[in-house]
């Protein structure tokens, strides 16, 4: 039986709305919850597409609105349709389309042919997509203040660029407890908005924001050492796109060090942790004397998965320690703000040549077994170590 509704189902998850002039909004389409495909045609009264219109269409993969009266698509129109991959808005009355509209979508194709698109910086992103052959863009006509049937690039004199963002930071070293002033300078045409992203700073400093485009200010009050390696980001947007810049404020603090007991990994490791900003220089002592590192006794830092902390972890790696390596190991850490030391005793194996006169002397009357094999004095596991 043929469907006489405004919108008729197509397959299990499609909807087709082609009865001329019967829709002025897409809001509240019945049974739209599981829609993956929506086809709209011949709807002259459908002039705007706002984010509320597509609310509840979270599964939508393909949207076609053609031969209709669409004049405006809101920058956040597809906020609720993150899976949208095919968008066809051809043969409407669109003069422009913001880059924000498609930001965050993984579009495989975008069709805008048959629209009176006006060539301006606001469509620079679209021209770039088309030139670079990105995601099957089809525009066919871009009007440069007049009708035309060919792709017209912007004039050579037109400079379309995203904003330029620069963050000014203090030149002097920052210490714990200081207040830090940062300024974000934004330059560019048709600036729309700008702000700071400070999500990494929680607990590291109290934040005060002030000012507005083109110069935004930020004061980090009473900074702590936790601020190190944390990103402070300033972003700005205009018609062409978005730019952002991140900086890290380096907060100086004294060196600290912690040593653990020697452990067997691939060979032997005396684990350590050092902290401080700037990163401290390290020196090992063995029984009070400077330990010169070699290919069989050397410092090895762990490759840290955490890039947002100053603390570094590692090992004094002893590849083949014997009794001569038994003793007291001290790690000295120093930076311009202070120094620290930690020590640990390590015993890798007994001295095979130590003789205690009190010990009974073993006497063997049986012949020595020529087939005996000596065991490694330090047993070594073969698992791959970290680092």
């Amino acid at each position: 039986a043929s469907c006489r509704e405004v919108c008729c189902p197509v397959g299990p998850s499609g909807l087709r709305c082609t009865r001329a002039g019967s829709l002025d909004t897409l809001r509240g389409l019945r049974g739209a919850g599981n829609l993956t495909e929506l086809y709209v045609e011949n709807q002259q009264h459908l002039q705007r597409l706002e984010f509320e219109d597509l609310q509840g269409l979270g599964e939508l993969r393909s949207l076609t609105i053609v031969k209709s009266g669409l004049r405006f698509v809101a920058p956040d129109a597809f906020r609720f349709t993150p899976r949208l991959s095919h968008l066809n808005l051809s043969s409407n009355a669109l003069e422009s389309l913001s880059w924000k509209t498609v930001q965050g979508l993984s579009l495989q194709d975008l069709t805008l042919s048959g629209n009176p698109l006006h060539c301006s910086c606001a469509l620079f992103w679209l021209q770039r997509w088309e030139q670079e052959g990105l995601c099957g863009v089809h525009t066919q006509t871009l009007h440069d203040s007049g009708p035309g049937d060919q792709f017209l690039p912007l004039g050579h004199n037109t400079s379309c660029g995203v904003p330029t963002v620069k963050i000014q930071m203090p030149n002097d070293s920052v210490e714990v407890g200081d207040d830090v002033f940062l300024q974000c300078q934004v330059e560019g045409l048709a600036l729309q908005q700008a702000d700071w992203i400070l999500t990494e700073l929680e607990g590291a400093a109290t934040v005060k924001k002030f000012g507005d485009l083109p110069s935004l200010g930020l004061i980090l009050v009473n900074v702590t050492s936790d601020l190190n390696k944390k990103n402070v980001t300033c972003w700005a947007e205009n018609d062409v796109g978005r730019a952002e810049v991140s900086v890290q404020v380096s907060v100086s603090f004294p060196a600290s060090v912690h040593l653990g007991l020697a452990v067997e990994q691939h060979h032997w490791c005396i684990p350590f942790s050092v902290d401080g900003q700037p990163a401290p220089s390290l020196r090992w002592l063995f029984n009070g004397s400077v330990l010169n590192e070699t290919s069989f006794i050397f410092t090895q830092f762990l490759e840290s998965a955490l890039t947002n902390e100053t603390m570094r972890h590692g090992c004094l790696r002893l590849n083949q320690p014997t009794h001569v390596n038994n003793g007291n190991y001290t790690l000295l850490a120093a930076n311009p703000y202070g120094q620290a030391a930690a020590s640990v005793m390590a015993a890798f194996m007994d001295n095979p040549f130590e003789f205690n006169p009190e010990d009974p002397i073993p006497v063997s009357f049986s012949p020595v077994d020529g087939n005996s094999t000596s065991r490694d004095p330090v047993e070594k596991k073969d698992e791959t170590p970290f680092g």
């Epitope: 010169n292 590849n319 014997t322 490694d376 170590p385």
Partner: antibody, heavy 117, light 106 residues
Framework: QVQLQQPGAELVKPGASVKLSCKSS????????MHWVRQRPGQGLEWIGE????????NYNEKFKNRATLTVDISSSTAYMQLSSLTSEDSAVYYC??????????WGQGTSVTVSS | QVVLTQSPAIMSASPGEKVTMTCSAS?????MHWYQQKSGTSPKRWIY???KLASGVPTRFSGSGSGTSYSLTISSMEAEDAATYFC?????????FGSGTRLEIK
């Protein structure tokens, strides 16, 4: 796979210097010590020194301390050994070899250095 | 420095024969390492940490020892084992090698 590539041969004059290269591939260059070992014709192996690209730490055999200089270029994963004031006694094959937890697990093919006027 | 003395300097063995060569250190070392070198090629790591066989080394090879006395043994000589074998210590700077034992096939 791990490769340590060395040029085949160098001919140098007595009193001059030679800078030998050893280009690494197939592993993380900075995580391994690089050793330099030489072998004079029909003779045994003689350790010249070692360098740790991670921090530039160098240890030399006292015998070569004043004449050998070990360096690395991390950007190209290449280790270098420069030997100065060469005499005919320095004619030898010079090898590079890498170690991490075990000694000299991989060796280069060696560069034959001939000192002759 | 630790001086390593290898003996014998040259030896020959028939196929199937058991072969033992020794390496004596002037002072105690924790482990000994052995390299095989054939004429015109680079040395290859052969036995490390006294008794561990490097990858690809036949199981007829074994290593043992401690302190100042170490040895490399081939349980049953084969033609491909003919080579020079060097011992090496990795316990003190400078690293040192023995002068080598040249093993020939009869």
């Amino acid at each position: 796979q791990v490769q340590l590539q060395q040029p085949g041969a160098e001919l140098v004059k007595p009193g001059a210097s030679v800078k030998l290269s050893c280009k690494s591939s197939g592993y993380t260059f900075t995580n391994y010590w690089m050793h330099w070992v030489r072998q004079r014709p029909g003779q045994g192996l003689e350790w010249i020194g070692e360098i740790y690209p991670n921090n530039g730490r160098v240890n030399y055999n006292e015998k070569f301390k004043n004449r050998a200089t070990l360096t690395v270029d991390i950007s190209s994963s290449t280790a270098y050994m420069q030997l100065s004031s060469l005499t005919s006694e320095d004619s030898a094959v010079y090898y590079c070899a890498r170690s991490r937890y075990d000694p000299m697990e991989d060796w280069g093919q060696g560069t034959s250095v001939t000192v002759s006027s | 420095q630790v001086v390593l003395t290898q003996s014998p300097a040259i030896m020959s063995a028939s196929p199937g024969e058991k072969v033992t060569m020794t390496c004596s250190a002037s002072s105690s070392v924790g482990y000994m390492h052995w390299y095989q070198q054939k004429s015109g090629t680079s040395p290859k790591r052969w036995i490390y940490d006294t008794s561990k066989l490097a990858s690809g080394v036949p199981t007829r090879f074994s290593g043992s020892g401690s302190g100042t006395s170490y040895s490399l043994t081939i349980s049953s000589m084969e033609a491909e084992d003919a080579a020079t074998y060097f011992c090496q210590q990795w316990s003190s700077i400078p690293l040192t090698f023995g002068s080598g034992t040249r093993l020939e096939i009869k």
